[in-house]
């Protein structure tokens, strides 16, 4: 078997072997190395000698295998866009950043530029859990029967209605999707003032 | 011979104070990123806090924010970690750790000898 | 926090034989460009930890090769292929994708 051609190397067809990290260099019909992540070009290549690369200086970063002469700057996360930071920058990755809690992304360009406060599920209600905190708006669905929320809230859950047996008490009134079940003492009679309250 | 030798620890009541320090030498300190990982004692290792190269950048542990700062002087090739209101829980011995490529925090390739700080009363 | 979760607790090898620890994360440690942010250290009896393996697979400089690191997402293994009595100690993987940085609770290797 031949052996294995070392960049830099000739190319009649404008291909290289490795795609992800070489690149084609036109000017002299040859395959390069690319630079891995972290780093960048700091010297071409040329028929005799290959890439020379650099790491990126400190607030800058490469993701990529790539062919690039500079760095791309760190972002910081914008705190007025609704962002916070989850992981830093480093040579080899931008910022990462997600909405800060209670809101969710309102513009996405690759990634979240925009973020905005989550909305209100009503009482008798509350918010879908989503898979992914922050990918979406709130989509607020009822209570499942035997459940109550009481309060507009964006991030409220829905409890179970309270059982007044357990409390040795009697239903004094069923709980609703908005309210809880309203307990007495068996021997009292529920007063008119007391009606939606709980007796202990 | 890259080394790192830390010093500073030693025993101090709960709501005190102590710096920590890591003498570095044998290799461009300026270039690195810097961490302070922890060890309670029969525990694992807890990572603390990092600092990038320039000092630009700081990150902590929850567990730490807010009463402890890292900080480095790259004229004197030397870290710090000032501890404050130091809390029982926060004894250990405490490691100083170069991070293995500039301007990363991925592979902590050298490692002080550590020292013991003990918070009681 | 992203949650590191090591096993065995303790792992009684023989000389000679291979030894596998496991390290398995709450969440992904691939990013985008392929690699993997995930460090194996080892610490010997009375020593300070010491990197084995760093993003993912990539030997530490002085490390034999017996040692190698693989897995990808959220499921990750140290191997050593022929265990020697100076590799006794506690293994810990530590993840870098995101801050807090986070160890697993360590594996502790002894030989039988």
């Known amino acids: 078997s031949q052996p294995q051609a070392v960049p830099p190397y000739a190319s009649e067809n404008q291909t290289c072997r490795d795609q992800e990290k070489e690149y084609y260099e036109p000017q002299h019909r040859i395959c390069c190395s690319r630079c891995p992540p972290g780093t960048y070009v700091s010297a071409k290549c040329s028929r005799i000698r290959d890439t020379v690369c650099a790491t990126c200086a400190e607030n800058s970063y490469n993701e990529h295998w790539n062919y690039l002469t500079i760095c791309q700057l760190c972002r910081p996360c914008d705190p007025v866009m609704g962002l916070e930071e989850i992981a830093p920058c480093t040579s080899k990755r931008k910022t990462q950043c997600r909405c800060q809690p209670g809101m969710f992304c309102a513009a996405w360009a690759l990634e979240c530029t925009h973020c905005e406060l989550l909305s209100d599920c009503p009482p008798g209600t509350e918010a879908e859990l989503k898979d992914e905190v922050g990918k979406g708006n709130n989509h607020c669905v009822p209570c499942k029967a035997g459940h109550f929320q009481n309060t507009s809230s964006p991030s409220a859950r829905c409890q179970p209605h309270t059982r007044c047996e357990n409390q040795g008490l009697v239903e004094a009134a069923p709980g609703t999707a908005q309210s809880d079940t309203t307990c007495k003492n068996p021997l009292e009679p529920l007063p008119p003032e007391m009606s939606g309250t709980m007796l202990m | 011979e890259v080394q790192l030798l830390e010093s500073g620890g030693g025993l101090v009541q709960p709501g005190g104070s102590l710096r920590l320090s890591c003498a570095a030498s044998?290799?461009?300190?300026?270039?690195?990123?810097m961490s302070w990982v922890r060890q309670a004692p029969g525990k694992g290792l807890e990572w603390v806090s990092t600092i990038s190269g320039s000092g630009g950048s700081t990150y902590y542990a929850d567990s730490v924010k807010g009463r402890f700062t890292i900080s480095r002087d790259n004229s004197k090739n030397t870290l710090n970690l000032q501890m404050n209101s130091l809390r029982a829980e926060d004894t250990a011995v405490y490691y100083c750790?170069?991070?293995?490529?500039?301007?990363?925090?991925?592979?902590?390739?050298?490692w002080g000898q550590g020292t013991t700080v003990t918070v009681s009363s | 926090d992203i949650v590191m979760t090591q096993s065995p607790l303790s792992l009684p090898v023989t000389l000679g034989e291979s030894a596998s620890i496991s390290c398995r994360c709450s969440?992904?440690?691939?990013?985008?460009?392929?690699?993997?942010?995930l460090d194996w250290y080892l610490q010997k009896p009375g020593q300070s930890p010491q990197l084995l393996i760093y993003l993912g697979s990539n030997r530490a400089s002085g490390v034999p090769d017996r040692f190698s690191g693989s897995g990808s997402g959220t499921d990750f293994t140290l191997k050593i292929s022929r265990v020697e009595a100076e590799d006794v100690g506690v293994y810990y993987c530590m993840q870098t994708i995101q801050t807090p940085l986070t160890f697993g609770g360590g594996t502790k290797v002894e030989i039988k």
């Open positions: 969440q992904s440690l691939l990013y985008s460009s392929g690699y993997i942010d």
């Open positions: 750790a170069k991070v293995r490529d500039n301007w990363n925090y991925d592979g902590m390739d050298v």
């Open positions: 044998g290799f461009t300190f300026s270039s690195y990123a």
